[in-house]
């Protein structure tokens, strides 16, 4: 008789999840010499241990602590790029501007990027059928708690001038409910971070509006200022240049300082 299985509203664990995490870990540690000491089997064991046999709505940050410890990594704290609702462009940017880092350029972010996972209470099985949706089911699910944990740590590590890339094409350029708005903004350390500089990416060259005047940007400015961190905002009108440089990263026109 088939055992009853909880049906969640979200997609199930990404197929070949264990193999993908392990392969990504091996690839990352080969490319990044400073992480060569990492034992990828231990990383996978710690990752698995965070959610296997646990109810997928009762995951805590503590569950991920062994993984966090194994994935401890130092990135230049003054070269951090946060992003909200514009992941692809942020990643394309750091692929070319190699001295800046998004969360997904770190080992833990790289391992989990675009993946979904969850287990089942009291069984060692991975649930490939469905996983909890953050809105419809529960917020303390394995994926959400993971990103909340690593995002908090990433923001806490930042110093000096921190940049955030925001999508000027969205109705809410700054969204309080995004990971950036709900986690990262509140975990920047005022004693270390001098300024948060927002880059508002326009949809195209013909859009000449000052999106730094957007009410949601003013809201972000207010939140940041109350935390005793300076805020600045720049309109970025040339996403076409990003894309040109992604295609031709060796072009000398793609190496300007920020």
């Amino acid at each position: 008789v088939p055992r009853w299985r909880q049906q969640w509203s979200g997609p199930g664990t990404t197929k070949r999840f264990p193999e993908t995490v392990l392969a990504r870990c091996v690839k990352y540690t080969e490319i990044h010499p400073e992480m060569r000491h990492v034992d990828c089997q231990s990383v996978w064991d710690a990752f698995k241990g965070a959610f296997i046999s646990k109810h997928p709505c009762n995951i805590t940050e503590e569950d991920y602590q062994p993984l966090m410890k194994l994935g401890t990594q130092t990135v230049p704290c003054n070269k951090i790029l946060l992003w909200s609702r514009i992941k692809d462009l942020a990643h394309q940017f750091t692929q070319v501007q190699r001295d800046m880092f998004t969360l997904e350029d770190t080992l833990l972010g790289y391992l989990a990027d675009d993946l979904t996972w969850c287990g089942e209470f009291n069984t060692s099985k991975i649930n490939y059928q469905s996983c909890p949706d953050w809105r419809k089911d529960c917020s303390n699910n394995p994926v959400s708690v993971f990103w909340k944990t690593v995002s908090r740590r990433f923001a806490e590590a930042a110093c000096d001038v921190v940049h955030v890339m925001l999508n000027g094409s969205r109705s809410k350029i700054f969204d309080k409910n995004s990971t950036f708005g709900s986690v990262e903004v509140h975990n920047l350390q005022p004693e270390k971070v001098q300024t948060l500089e927002a880059w508002v990416i326009h949809g195209g060259r013909e859009d000449s509006r000052d999106l730094c005047q957007d009410p949601t940007i003013k809201e972000l400015e207010s939140i940041i200022s109350k935390r005793n961190i300076q805020f600045s905002c720049k309109n970025i009108y040339r996403p076409d240049k990003f894309l040109q440089c992604v295609k031709n990263p060796e072009d000398s026109s793609c190496t300007s300082e920020i």
Partner: antibody
Amino acid sequence: QVQLVESGGGLVQPGGSLRLSCAASGFTFSSYAMNWVRQAPGKGLEWVSGISSWGSSTYYADSVKGRFTISRDNSKNTLYLQMNSLRAEDTAVYYCAREDGSYMTDYFAYWGQGTLVTVSS
Amino acid sequence: DIELTQPPSVSVAPGQTARISCSGDNIGHYYVSWYQQKPGQAPVLVIYSDSNRPSGIPERFSGSNSGNTATLTISGTQAEDEADYYCQSYNGTYVFGGGTKLTVL
């Protein structure tokens, strides 16, 4: 080293046409967007027109839209500005300028020496 | 389009600090570059992205930008710094300020 050399300027009557050229050397021409900036005698700088690295996108100041056409030939490392229906107010030194600042910001790191266009009857 | 306004002229004694302003509505929301132009010559980029100096430009040139004003500062001004200075920004089209004539007394 980067070199931009403009040519094709001269005296032309109102309503006439002129074609400016800018020969580029010392860098990979096809990697850079290029622009024309002009300066009327005794006046400030005014951006005229720009073109993307492969020529697929062109941009114009309102004052020249419909009259000027920017183009480039990457095989010849040359930038062009075809100027039609010229007016007295188009009289200026025309500079060819390389657009730099790939991601976040746009500026002109290299300029030619300029070529003078005089529109007068 | 943003409008950039510069004072027509600024005077400074040699060795003193010259400050050239470039004002515009919320200009701090845009990156600003500065160009130096000497008579009969093409402009030369001296500051880009608000405060960055291209290689070959002396350290005495610096820039800042916030609120409604961007500023080019020349510390320990030298006679050779006498020139016209233009600020420039971008909001889908390139915009230049009207220029400032710097006179070294």
